[in-house]
C-alpha cells in the first residue's frame, strides 16, 4: 500500500462481551416430536469475542439416562462431554478448549457455553439426549464471524482504494458512483480474508466517492473527496 | 396405541381413603413419567404430581403432598394414587397423563376416575 | 410458583370466524430457548386433548386452523376458522419446571 495516502479512514467494531443465545426459537422447530429419534440441525453465525450458549432439546432431567455433546472442531480430534444421571458424574473426552464449558452442573442446565468465541470454535456442536425410548439430538454448525477492518484511501490520481481486511466471511465492496474497479480477495491461514477494491473515475464533476462494504456482522460506509487532478478544468455541475 | 386405562367412579366417606389405579399399555411402562392432575366439577386443571416408573422419582405439589400417595407396578404397568382423610373438597375427577419427552407435554391422558367424598 | 392467567374466561364466536384465547405468564415461562406453554381442548365428559405444544407447534393429528403464538409472558391461541365441534373449554399449561400449573380455562361457544 502506498505511503502518500491522502486520506485514511478507519472502522474497526469494538466489541464488548455480548452474549448470543444459540438456543433454537421454539418458531424454528419443522419437525414433528411426538416420536424418538427426532434430529435438526441449524447453521448459527456468531460474531468472534461474544459468549454463545448452546442448548439441547426441551427434555427433562427426569426424563433422561445420558447428555452428551459432541464437540468437532477442525483439525482437532472429537470432543465429548458427558453427564450420566443416574451416578451424578460428568465426563470429558479429548476437550481441551477451556472456554467451551457447560453452563452451569448438568443436573440443573444441560446448555454449553463458549465464552468469547474465536475463530478456533468454528465447528458443529451436538447434544444428545438418551432417554429410555430413545435419543434426541440438536446440532449446530457453528460460523465465527469476524467484522473487518474498514479503510479508504487515495493513492493516486482520482483512483480510490477501499480495503475490507481480515473478515469472516469475506466483505462485499460496492461504490458509489460506480467507477472502474478492480477486486483482489486474499486468504489468511486462520480463515479470514481480506477483500481489497480498487477504483478510477476519469469523470472528473465526481468529487466525492463511497466504499460501502457489505458483511454479516454489519454494514459500513466510508466515504473520501477525490483530490483533483492538477491543471484539470473542472467541468460545471 | 398408547391406551391409559382407569379405574371405575368411587363413592366414599369423609375421613376414609380411596386408591385408584392407571393401567397403560401399548408402550414401554418405565420408560415415561406418569403425572396425576384433578379436575373439580365445573372447575379448571390442577397438578397433583408425579411418578417415574423406572426409578420410582417421584415429585408432588406442595399443596397435594400430605393427601396423594403416588406407587407404581412394574409388573402390571399400572400407577396408583391414594388419596388420603378425604373431605367434600376432595371429589373431582382424577386423571392420569403420560409426560412426552419433548417439551413436558401430555399427549395421551386416562380416560379420569370420579371421586365423590359424601357421608 | 408461575401463575397462568387466562382471558377471556368466556366468549361466543360465529361459525367459520377466528376466536383468540389469551394466557398470561406470571413470570417468562422460557428456559434454553424454549417456551414451555402449552395449549388443550376439554370437552364435557372427557380429558383434556393437546393441541399446541412449547407455545406454537401443532400436535399431530389437530387440525390446522388451531395455531399459537406468543413468547416470554404473553402467548395466543387462535383458532380460525371455528367450527361447531370446537365449542370447548381451553386451557394453557406450564411445564418448565415444578409445579406445573394450568391457566383458569376459557369456554369457547359457537354462535
Known amino acids: 500500500q502506498p505511503n502518500n495516502s491522502l486520506m485514511l479512514q478507519t472502522s474497526k467494531e469494538n466489541h464488548a462481551l455480548a452474549s448470543s443465545s444459540l438456543c433454537m426459537d421454539e418458531k424454528q422447530i419443522t419437525q414433528n416430536y411426538s416420536k424418538v429419534l427426532a434430529e435438526v440441525n441449524t447453521s448459527w453465525p456468531v460474531k468472534m469475542a461474544t459468549n454463545a450458549v448452546l442448548c439441547c432439546p426441551p427434555i427433562a432431567l427426569r426424563n433422561l439416562i445420558i447428555i452428551t455433546w459432541e464437540i468437532i472442531l477442525r483439525g482437532q480430534p472429537s470432543c465429548t462431554k458427558a453427564y450420566k444421571k443416574e451416578t451424578n458424574e460428568t465426563k470429558e473426552t479429548n476437550c481441551t478448549d477451556e472456554r467451551i464449558t457447560w453452563v452451569s452442573r448438568p443436573d440443573q442446565n444441560s446448555d454449553l457455553q463458549i465464552r468469547t468465541v474465536a475463530i478456533t470454535h468454528d465447528g458443529y456442536y451436538r447434544c444428545i439426549m438418551v432417554t429410555p425410548d430413545g435419543n434426541f439430538h440438536r446440532g449446530y454448525h457453528l460460523q465465527v464471524l469476524v467484522t473487518p477492518e474498514v479503510t479508504l484511501f487515495q493513492n493516486r490520481n482520482r483512483t480510490a482504494v477501499c480495503k475490507a481486511v481480515a473478515g469472516k466471511p469475506a466483505a462485499h465492496i460496492s461504490w458509489i458512483p460506480e467507477g472502474d474497479c478492480a477486486t483482489k480477495q486474499e486468504y489468511w491461514s486462520n480463515g479470514t480474508v481480506t477483500v481489497k477494491s480498487t477504483c478510477h473515475w476519469e469523470v472528473h464533476n465526481v468529487s466525492t466517492v463511497t466504499c460501502h462494504v457489505s458483511h454479516l456482522t454489519g454494514n459500513k460506509s466510508l466515504y473520501i473527496e477525490l483530490l483533483p487532478v492538477p491543471g484539470a478544468k473542472k467541468s460545471a455541475k | 396405541e398408547v391406551q391409559l386405562q382407569q379405574s371405575g367412579p368411587e363413592l366414599v366417606k369423609p375421613g376414609a381413603s380411596v386408591k385408584m389405579s392407571c393401567k397403560a399399555s401399548?408402550?414401554?411402562?418405565?420408560?415415561?413419567?406418569m403425572h396425576w392432575v384433578k379436575q373439580k366439577p365445573g372447575q379448571g386443571l390442577e397438578w397433583i404430581g408425579y411418578?417415574?416408573?423406572?426409578?420410582?422419582?417421584?415429585k408432588h405439589n406442595e399443596k397435594f403432598k400430605d393427601k396423594a400417595t403416588l406407587t407404581s407396578a412394574k409388573s402390571s404397568s399400572t400407577v396408583y394414587m391414594e388419596l388420603s382423610s378425604l373431605t367434600s373438597e376432595d371429589s373431582a375427577v382424577y386423571y392420569c397423563?403420560?409426560?412426552?419427552?419433548?417439551?413436558?407435554?401430555?399427549?395421551?391422558w386416562g380416560q379420569g376416575t370420579l371421586v365423590t367424598v359424601s357421608a | 410458583d408461575i401463575v397462568l392467567t387466562q382471558s377471556p374466561a368466556s366468549l361466543a364466536v360465529s361459525l367459520g370466524q377466528r376466536a383468540t384465547i389469551s394466557c398470561r405468564a406470571s413470570k417468562s415461562v422460557r428456559t434454553s430457548g424454549y417456551s414451555y406453554l402449552h395449549w388443550y381442548q376439554q370437552k364435557p365428559g372427557q380429558p383434556p386433548k393437546l393441541l399446541i405444544y412449547l407455545a406454537s407447534n401443532l400436535e399431530s393429528g389437530v387440525p390446522a386452523r388451531f395455531s399459537g403464538s406468543g413468547s416470554g409472558t404473553d402467548f395466543t391461541l387462535n383458532i380460525h376458522p371455528v367450527e361447531e365441534e370446537d365449542a370447548a373449554t381451553y386451557y394453557c399449561?406450564?411445564?418448565?419446571?415444578?409445579?406445573?400449573?394450568f391457566g383458569g380455562g376459557t369456554k369457547l361457544e359457537i354462535k
Open positions: 411418578i417415574h416408573p423406572y426409578n420410582d422419582d417421584i
Open positions: 401399548g408402550y414401554t411402562f418405565t420408560s415415561y413419567v
Open positions: 397423563a403420560r409426560e412426552e419427552y419433548y417439551g413436558s407435554r401430555f399427549a395421551y
Open positions: 399449561q406450564y411445564s418448565g419446571e415444578l409445579p406445573f400449573t
